[in-house]
Interface confidence: low
């Protein structure tokens, strides 16, 4: 015997209280697949969340974040504060990147400058809090008398302490 509920399309639920007839989802609820015995409550985009897509009878609402914040997690489950370029978000708020690190985005953490010497290259342009160093040709490729910029100090890393 076929389950009568399997005939209920998305946007409805199989109402056990009404002889398993297909009833439309109540307001602020949805069912995204057929054969559902209940409808799911629509997500509410409140506070720092704002509505990107309204809830319908067949699909949940989608949220994004208000200006100054960005989404984190599956389906934008969290909003994280934006920082400025050259900063990273810590549990105490936005903090400037330590010397030897940079962040060119409004999110994420500060990353160490590229160590040009590992690739046998010289530093063409010094790094800043907002930008990585630019590596140039290897010192051997430079013409005689050409001076190269001093490579940056290593970035602060767990287990390392700047003196």
């Amino acid at each position: 015997l076929q389950d009568p509920c399997s005939n209920c399309p998305a946007g409805t639920f199989c109402d056990n209280n009404r002889n398993q007839i297909c009833s439309p989802c109540p307001p602020n609820s949805f069912s995204s697949a057929g054969g559902q015995r209940t409808c799911d409550i629509c997500r509410q985009c409140k506070g720092v969340f704002r509505t990107r897509k309204e809830c319908s009878s067949t699909s949940n609402a989608e949220c994004d974040c208000t200006p100054g914040f960005h989404c984190l997690g599956a389906g934008c489950s969290m909003c994280e504060q934006d920082c400025k370029q050259g900063q990273e978000l810590t549990k105490k708020g936005c903090k400037d990147c330590c010397f030897g690190t940079f962040n060119d985005q409004k999110r994420g953490i500060c990353r160490p400058w590229t160590n040009c010497s590992l690739d046998g290259k010289s530093v063409l342009v010094n790094g800043t809090k907002e930008r990585d160093v630019v590596c140039g040709p290897s010192p051997a490729d430079l013409s005689p008398g050409a001076s190269s910029v001093t490579p940056p100090a290593p970035a602060r890393e767990p287990g390392h302490s700047p003196q």
Partner: antibody, heavy 118, light 108 residues
Framework: EVQLLESGGGLVQPGGSLRLSCAAS????????MSWVRQAPGKGLEWVSD????????DYADSVKGRFTISRDNSKNTLYLQMNSLRAEDTAVYYC???????????WGQGTLVTVSS | EIVLTQSPGTLSLSPGERATLSCRAS???????LAWYQQKPGQAPRLLIY???SRATGIPDRFSGSGSGTDFTLTISRLEPEDFAVYYC?????????FGQGTKVEIK
């Protein structure tokens, strides 16, 4: 070599006070956030409090808020934890740790035991 | 408060075996803010992994971290005798800073 050395622990009666110190060496103390983390006997780790490099911004676990005060003296490279109105549940080994914020706690002291008992 | 739940509570393994430790967060945590520590009896914790997957200075490459969102894993590829200890995960994404309850890795 980075070193953190706690002192000031001991036996105290409920309702009493104690001040813990953490002497730091081997790094630029005034550049780092610092934290206190405690561990009750046979239990897990519990963050207690932290302080920013200048000493102007502090935060506390709810369990100690209003009773404990974190402070620092950058001229002495020392971190402090003033503990008032102590309770039996404050009994623990107290560790000071260098706090890299995003990156966790990269250096820890050896800990000092605080026992609150009558 | 972000609650971190570690499993299993105890892991009984032999040297040379692979250990897989889990840490589940009660809400999404940016992987940049998740760390793992090792603690041996009578010693202070030691930072192993930061940013969910980056090894701290001096940590052997048999230790690796992975995961994102709410599920994080610490893997010890081949257990050495000195690896038998308690392991804690920790988040510094939001206050209060929280630790998991720990996983004890013991010799079988």
């Amino acid at each position: 070599e980075v070193q953190l050395l706690e002192s000031g622990g001991g036996l105290v009666q409920p309702g009493g006070s104690l001040r813990l110190s953490c002497a730091a060496s081997g790094f630029t103390f005034s550049s780092y956030d610092m934290s206190w983390v405690r561990q009750a006997p046979g239990k897990g780790l519990e963050w207690v409090s932290d302080i920013d490099p200048t000493g102007s911004k502090t935060d506390y676990a709810d369990s100690v808020k209003g009773r404990f005060t974190i402070s620092r003296d950058n001229s002495k490279n020392t971190l402090y934890l003033q503990m008032n109105s102590l309770r039996a549940e404050d009994t623990a080994v107290y560790y000071c740790a260098r706090d890299l914020m995003v990156y966790g706690f990269d250096y820890w002291g050896q800990g000092t035991l605080v026992t609150v008992s009558s | 408060e972000i609650v971190l739940t570690q499993s299993p509570g105890t892991l009984s393994l032999s040297p040379g075996e692979r250990a897989t430790l889990s840490c589940r967060a009660s809400q999404s945590v940016s992987s940049s803010y998740l760390a793992w520590y090792q603690q041996k009896p009578g010693q202070a914790p030691r930072l192993l992994i930061y940013g969910a997957s980056s090894r701290a200075t001096g940590i052997p490459d048999r230790f690796s971290g992975s995961g994102s969102g709410t599920d994080f894993t610490l893997t010890i590829s081949r257990l050495e005798p000195e690896d038998f200890a308690v392991y804690y995960c920790q988040q510094s994404y939001s206050y209060p800073v929280t630790f998991g309850q720990g996983t004890k890795v013991e010799i079988k």
